[in-house]
């Protein structure tokens, strides 16, 4: 969020500086022009570090559902199918934005709001403490 | 995003039903009470996938700035130190909502948008394809 | 125009498995989830699972854990459930049903169905 | 599980009569849909989120309560509202449905 001088096509604002509240239009743009972005939807099983992903409602959050990766082992899984415990699945997080209706129940009034979430795992040499 | 009866204490909409344009307060509320939300900051460089981050950065959007991972290796690391290009690192990715100044330059008028982002790398199995 | 077009009615022996299809057309696959819902002849609806298309997530009613398994391919825009060790009581109509991830104009709940598609279990 | 329970199971009216068809669920839960089904067709989403008519759903129509109770009213009843109605929570898993309310017109 950055103050730009005044386009005057631009909607009419009451702060002139900095939006502290400002209008948005929910009609999603998808900047994702590729026919099939996700192609990552089958990582979860073939990774070394596997993950399960977990449905997270809220209905006052926009967007409502978020799914959320949680590692399935301490190791991560050897070629022979194994788990290794030398080694560690650790959950790769992002803090991402939502909009929070506030006040609760508004149809038409948000917040932002960062929240972390869980995508999915990577395996990582665990960092050893040697006690002196 | 549902219609919810209006309730007194919300602000005023234009349409009743379904909100295209909402109001949106962009100061932001964390919700991560960790005092280190950032605990897989070191991952990138510990993973068996390891991975560089990228600078995005896009005035027009709101987080202007975002980081984007990118796979170092083709395959994975071995405990050794050598790649093993008979697994593949592969990103992680999400979709996640940001904020796009629509019309362009308006400091208090945004259009919601999905973009695809790569968080991080995971080590897969490849799928081999058997030729008949 | 929004449609789910779900497979053929199936005939199947007790101890089978059923995998029935549902092709999603009209809107984009993997902004909305694909929940499956069954109801057995003159009774209720029940919900078995969801499938997120995007992340591949899946949810299932502990009833059906362990013996469906809720599938999706995007580059079809199809969703699968797979009922395994089929029992007499299987026997009822399964409905696909699609339910939004993100705005639009859609209202978080299951909008559109499928037609249906008739498992009979007999021996 | 919460379990929904609507009354009643089976209500023959007459057209233009009121009709008030409640669905009390074993657990508070957030909102409540409510689904219409003919026979042979696929159920159809007619309320959501408690209050909330769906695309195409007549105004005499409307919805309303909280906690574990819940209401689909009909205001004056019509000849093609004749069907079974559906309550539906998810507000936890699994999600679940009432038993079905049929109306029949007289």
């Known amino acids: 969020g950055i103050a730009i001088p005044r386009n005057s096509g631009c909607p009419n604002s009451e702060d002139k500086n900095f939006p502290r509240t400002v209008m948005v239009n929910l009609n999603i743009h998808n900047r994702n022009t590729s026919t099939n972005p996700k192609r990552s939807s089958d990582y979860y099983n073939r990774s070394t570090s596997p993950w399960n992903l977990h449905r997270n409602e809220d209905p006052e959050r926009y967007p409502s559902v978020i799914w959320e990766a949680k590692c399935r082992h301490l190791g991560c899984v050897k070629a022979d199918g194994n788990v290794d415990y030398h080694m560690n699945s650790v959950p790769i997080q992002q803090e991402i934005l939502v909009l929070r209706r506030e006040p609760r129940h508004c149809p038409n009034s948000f917040r932002l709001e960062k929240i972390l979430v869980s995508v999915g795992c990577t395996c990582v040499t665990p960092i050893v403490h040697h006690v002196a | 995003g549902i219609a919810i009866p209006r309730n007194s204490g919300c602000p005023n909409s234009e349409d009743k039903n379904f909100p295209r344009t909402v109001m949106v307060n962009l100061n932001i509320h964390n919700r991560n009470t960790s005092t280190n939300p950032k605990r897989s900051s070191d991952y990138y460089n510990r993973s068996t996938s390891p991975w560089n981050l990228h600078r995005n950065e896009d005035p027009e959007r709101y987080p202007s700035v975002i980081w984007e991972a990118k796979c170092r290796h083709l395959g994975c690391v071995k405990a050794d130190g050598n790649v093993d290009y008979h697994m593949n690192s592969v990103p992680i990715q999400q979709e996640i909502l940001v904020l796009r100044r629509e019309p362009r330059h308006c400091p208090n008028s945004f259009r919601l948008e999905k973009i695809l982002v790569s968080v991080g790398c995971t080590c897969v199995t490849p799928i081999v394809h058997h030729v008949a | 125009e929004v449609q789910l077009v779900q497979s053929g009615a199936e005939v199947k022996k007790p101890g089978a498995s059923v995998k029935v299809s549902c092709k999603a057309s009209?809107?984009?696959?993997?902004?909305?989830?694909v929940h499956w819902v069954r109801q057995a002849p003159g009774q209720g609806l029940e919900w078995i699972g969801v499938?997120?298309?995007?992340?591949?997530?899946?949810a299932y009613n502990q009833k059906f854990e362990g013996r469906a398994t809720l599938t999706a391919d995007d580059s079809t825009n199809t969703a699968y459930m797979e009922l395994r060790s089929l029992r007499s009581d299987d026997t009822a109509v399964y409905y696909c049903t699609r339910y939004s991830l993100f705005y639009g104009s859609s209202p978080y709940a299951m909008d559109y169905w499928g037609q249906g598609t008739l498992v009979t279990v007999s021996s | 599980e919460i379990v929904l329970t609507q009354s009643p199971d089976f209500q023959s009216v007459t057209p233009k009569e009121k009709v008030t068809i409640t669905c009390s669920a074993s657990s508070s839960v957030n909102y409540m849909h409510w689904f219409q089904q003919k026979p042979d067709q696929s159920p159809k989403l007619w309320i959501y989120r408690t209050s909330n008519l769906a695309s195409g759903v007549p105004s005499r129509f409307s919805g309303s309560g909280s906690g574990t109770d819940y209401t689909l009213t009909i205001n004056s009843l019509e000849a093609e509202d004749a069907a079974t109605y559906y309550c539906?929570?998810?507000?936890?898993?699994?999600?679940?449905f009432g038993q079905g309310t049929k109306l029949e017109i007289k």
């Open positions: 499938i997120d298309p995007g992340t591949g997530g899946v």
């Open positions: 539906q929570q998810r507000s936890s898993y699994p999600w679940t």
């Open positions: 009209g809107y984009t696959f993997t902004d909305y989830e």
